[in-house]
Interface confidence: low
C-alpha cells in the first residue's frame, strides 16, 4: 500500500533505535571519510524530521522520497568537494540519477586506518559511560570500511557486541573475557561482509535474474521439502531485500527483511521443520538465525532427476514454452537433491543444461543429443571436489599460516603485477578457508570451500578493477561470477611477466618487528615472500622454503638478542646475501 509519508512509515515500522542505526549506516556507507560526529548530527536531524512526519504526514517535505531526503542532507554537507572530489558532482543531478551516482562512488578499499580495538578497560569505560554512542561508533566504523555491509545484519552484530560488553565488563578479567568473544564476532562479520559484497556484485553486474537463480539454488538446498512455488516466492522476496540493501535503500531493506522473516515463521509447515528455534528469537536474532538455518531433511522418495529433464519426451516443448520456469525447476530439483554441492557448482550445472537444450532442441533428434547431459556434468562436479581434497590435504599438512603462504606463492605467480598488499590480503583470506571449511563433515566441505573462495575472489576483482594491472586477473574477473573460481584455479605462472629486480631494502628489517603482534609479524613475512616470488617467479617451492626458514630463524635470533638493533644491522645484510644465493 502507498503511504503519504515514506519516512514516517519506515520510522513507525522499524522503531527509533533501528531507524537511527540504519540511517547512520547509510550515511557512513555513502560518505566514508566523514567523522562519527558529523554523521551523528545528520542522523539526529533526519530522526527529528521523521518524528514531525509521524505526528503529521502532511507536514512540509514529508511526502518526499527517502533518496531525496537523504541525498539533500548529504549534499548540504560543507566542504563536500574538498573532501570528496568528484562525488560532489552527484549533487548537480536529480533523483534517481543522484543516488546512482553516490553508489558509483562507494569505495571498496577506502584509505582508512585499520579499525583498532581499544584495550579492555578503556572500552568498558566508554561503553558504560554511553552505550548508545559507543555502538554508534561501532556502526560508523564498520559501515564506512564496508560500504556494502548488509545493514540489518550489521545491526545484529552491533547487538552481539553490546551483549558481549555488557557481560564481560562486569567480569574481573575483562581482557580474557572480551578478546575471544569479540574476535569471534569480528571474524563472522568480515565473512558476512565479503559474502554480501558478492551478492551486490551479482546484482550490479548481472541483474536480478542472476541473483534470483543464486537464491533459488540456496533456498532449495536448505528447504528441500518446500515446493517450487514456495521457493520461488522466497527467492523473489529475498531478491527484493538484497536489491534494496545493495542499492542503499536500507530502511526498506530492513523492513522487508523483517516481513520475510515473519512470513517464514508463519508458514513453517510449508517451508521447513527446522525453523522453530529461530522463530522463537527476537527480530534481529531471528532473521540472522533464519539466514543460516540448518538444511531440512531431504524427502526420502525423490525420483531420479533424469525422469523430468532427460527421459521425458516433452523436454524441448516444456523448455520452449517457458524457458525461465523450466530452467528454474531444473535448478530447484537438482539443488534440493544436492546440499553437498556449492551454489556456484549448481549454477554451472544449470548453465550447462541450458546450453545443451539450446543446442539440442534445434536438432533433428533432440533426445539423442541431450540424452548424455547428466554424464557431461561429471567433469564439472569432479573439478571442485578435487580442489577441496587437494587444498584440505595441504591445509592439514601445513596449518593455516603455512597454507596461506602456499596460496600466496601460487597467486603471486598467477598475477605478479598485483600489488603486494592486495596479494597478501587475498592469500590470508583465501587461506582461512582451511580453518573455516576443512574441519567440517565431508558433505559440507565443498559448499563451504567454493562459495567462500568465490566471495574472496570477488573482492580481489573489485580491488583490481580500480587499478587493472594483470591480464590474467582481468580475464577471470570479466567472465560470469560462477566461472571465476575455476578460472583463477586454472591460472598458471604468468609467462609475460618480467621479474622485479632484487632490492635489498625490500628485505631489510629492523628491531621494531619484534614487538609487533603475531598477525602483523606474519603479514611482514608474507610481504617479503610475495616480493621474493615477484623477483623469482619460477623459484621452486624448496628454494622459497629455504629462504623463508632462514628468514624466520633470523627473526627469532635477533628478537632474542640482547642488542637487537646491532643484530638486525649485522645479520640483515648476511640474510639478504644468503637469499640471493639460495635463489640464484
Amino acid at each position: 500500500e502507498a503511504h503519504k509519508s515514506e519516512i514516517a512509515h519506515r520510522y513507525n515500522d522499524l522503531g527509533e533505535q533501528h531507524f537511527k542505526g540504519l540511517v547512520l549506516i547509510a550515511f557512513s556507507q555513502y560518505l566514508q571519510k566523514c567523522s562519527y560526529d558529523e554523521h551523528a548530527k545528520l542522523v539526529q536531524e533526519v530522526t527529528d524530521f521523521a518524528k514531525t512526519c509521524v505526528a503529521d504526514e502532511s507536514a512540509a517535505n514529508c511526502d518526499k522520497s527517502l533518496h531525496t531526503l537523504f541525498g539533500d542532507k548529504l549534499c548540504a554537507i560543507p566542504n563536500l568537494r574538498e573532501n570528496y572530489g568528484e562525488l560532489a558532482d552527484c549533487c548537480t543531478k536529480q533523483e534517481p540519477e543522484r543516488n546512482e551516482c553516490f553508489l558509483q562512488h562507494k569505495d571498496d578499499n577506502p584509505s582508512l586506518p585499520p579499525f583498532e580495538r581499544p584495550e579492555a578497560e578503556a572500552m568498558c569505560t566508554s561503553f558504560k559511560e554511553n552505550p548508545t554512542t559507543f555502538m554508534g561508533h561501532y556502526l560508523h566504523e564498520v559501515a564506512r570500511r564496508h560500504p556494502y555491509f548488509y545493514a540489518p545484519e550489521l545491526l545484529y552484530y552491533a547487538e552481539q557486541y553490546n551483549e558481549i560488553l555488557t557481560q564481560c565488563c562486569a567480569e574481573a578479567d575483562k581482557e580474557s573475557c572480551l578478546t575471544p568473544k569479540l574476535d569471534g564476532v569480528k571474524e563472522k562479520a568480515l565473512v558476512s561482509s565479503v559474502r554480501q559484497r558478492m551478492k551486490c556484485s551479482s546484482m550490479q553486474k548481472f541483474g536480478e535474474r542472476a541473483f534470483k537463480a543464486w537464491a533459488v539454488a540456496r533456498l532449495s538446498q536448505t528447504f528441500p521439502n518446500a515446493d517450487f512455488a514456495e521457493i520461488t516466492k522466497l527467492a523473489t522476496d529475498l531478491t527484493k531485500v538484497n536489491k534494496e540493501c545493495c542499492h542503499g535503500d536500507l530502511l526498506e531493506c530492513a523492513d522487508d527483511r523483517a516481513e520475510l522473516a515473519k512470513y517464514m515463521c508463519e508458514n513453517q509447515a510449508t517451508i521447513s521443520s527446522k525453523l522453530q528455534t529461530c522463530c522463537d528469537k527476537p527480530l534481529l536474532k531471528k532473521a540472522h538465525c533464519l539466514s543460516e538455518v540448518e538444511h531440512d531433511t531431504m524427502p526420502a522418495d525423490l525420483p531420479a532427476i533424469a525422469a523430468d529433464f532427460v527421459e521425458d519426451q516433452e523436454v524441448c516443448k516444456n523448455y520452449a514454452e517457458a524457458k525461465d520456469v523450466f530452467l528454474g525447476t531444473f535448478l530447484y530439483e537438482y539443488s534440493r537433491r544436492h546440499p553437498d554441492y556449492s551454489v556456484s557448482l549448481l549454477l554451472r550445472l544449470a548453465k550447462k543444461y541450458e546450453a545443451t537444450l539450446e543446442k539440442c532442441c534445434a536438432e533433428a533428434n533432440p533426445p539423442a543429443c541431450y540424452g548424455t547431459v547428466l554424464a557431461e556434468f561429471q567433469p564439472l562436479v569432479e573439478e571442485p571436489k578435487n580442489l577441496v581434497k587437494t587444498n584440505c590435504d595441504l591445509y592439514e599438512k601445513l596449518g593455516e599460516y603455512g597454507f596461506q603462504n602456499a596460496i600466496l606463492v601460487r597467486y603471486t605467480q598467477k598475477a605478479p603485477q598485483v600489488s603486494t598488499p592486495t596479494l597478501v590480503e587475498a592469500a590470508r583470506n583465501l587461506g582461512r578457508v582451511g580453518t573455516k571449511c576443512c574441519t567440517l563433515p565431508e558433505d559440507q566441505r565443498l559448499p563451504c570451500v567454493e562459495d567462500y573462495l568465490s566471495a574472496i575472489l570477488n573482492r580481489v576483482c573489485l580491488l583490481h578493477e580500480k587499478t587493472p594491472v594483470s591480464e590474467h586477473v582481468t580475464k577471470c574477473c570479466s567472465g560470469s561470477l560462477v566461472e571465476r573460481r575455476p578460472c583463477f584455479s586454472a591460472l598458471t605462472v604468468d609467462e609475460t611477466y618480467v621479474p622485479k629486480e632484487f632490492k635489498a631494502e625490500t628485505f631489510t628489517f629492523h628491531s621494531d618487528i619484534c614487538t609487533l603482534p603475531e598477525k602483523e609479524k606474519q603479514i611482514k613475512k608474507q610481504t617479503a615472500l610475495a616480493e621474493l616470488v615477484k623477483h623469482k617467479p619460477k623459484a621452486t617451492a624448496e628454494q622459497l622454503k629455504t629462504v623463508m626458514d632462514d628468514f624466520a630463524q633470523f627473526l627469532d635470533t635477533c628478537c632474542k638478542a640482547a642488542d637487537k638493533d646491532t643484530c638486525f644491522s649485522t645479520e640483515g645484510p648476511n640474510l639478504v646475501t644468503r637469499c640471493k644465493d639460495a635463489l640464484a
Epitope: 591480464e471 609467462e495 609475460t496 611477466y497 621479474p499 629486480e501 632484487f502 623477483h535 623469482k536 617467479p537 619460477k538 623459484a539 621452486t540 628454494q543 635463489l583 640464484a584
Partner: nanobody, 123 residues
Amino acid sequence: EVQLVESGGGEVQPGGSLRLSCAASGFAFSTSGMVWVRQAPGKGLEWVSTISDDARIIRYAESVKGRFTISRDNAKNTLYLQMNSLRAEDTAVYYCATYRAGSRIGSYEDYYWGQGTLVTVKP
C-alpha cells in the same frame, strides 16, 4: 642456436620517432612471449614492454605508455617497437629478449638477449 638481432636505433631529436626491429631465430618464436628492455648510460636494466606469443597480452612501463607500441609478425619471426614522441630520457641501449625454455627461475639472467641497438635522443 638462439639469435636475437636488434636494428633500427640511431640519433633523433626530441619529439621524433624510430622503429626498432628484432629478428629472431633458433627457437620457437611464435610460441614465445617477448620483451623489450633498455639500459640508459650508467643505469640498470629497465623493462619497457611485453607481448605474449599471440599478441593478445601487451603491456608497457608507465614511462613509455601512450608513446611506444610493441608488435610482432610471427610469420617473419620479428618483434617491433614503434617509438614516438621520443624524449631525452629515452636515450639507452634497447634489447629484445625472451625467456630461456625450461628456465626454473625468472630473472634477467634467464633470458636470451640480443646485442642491443643504441637510441640517442638529443636536440
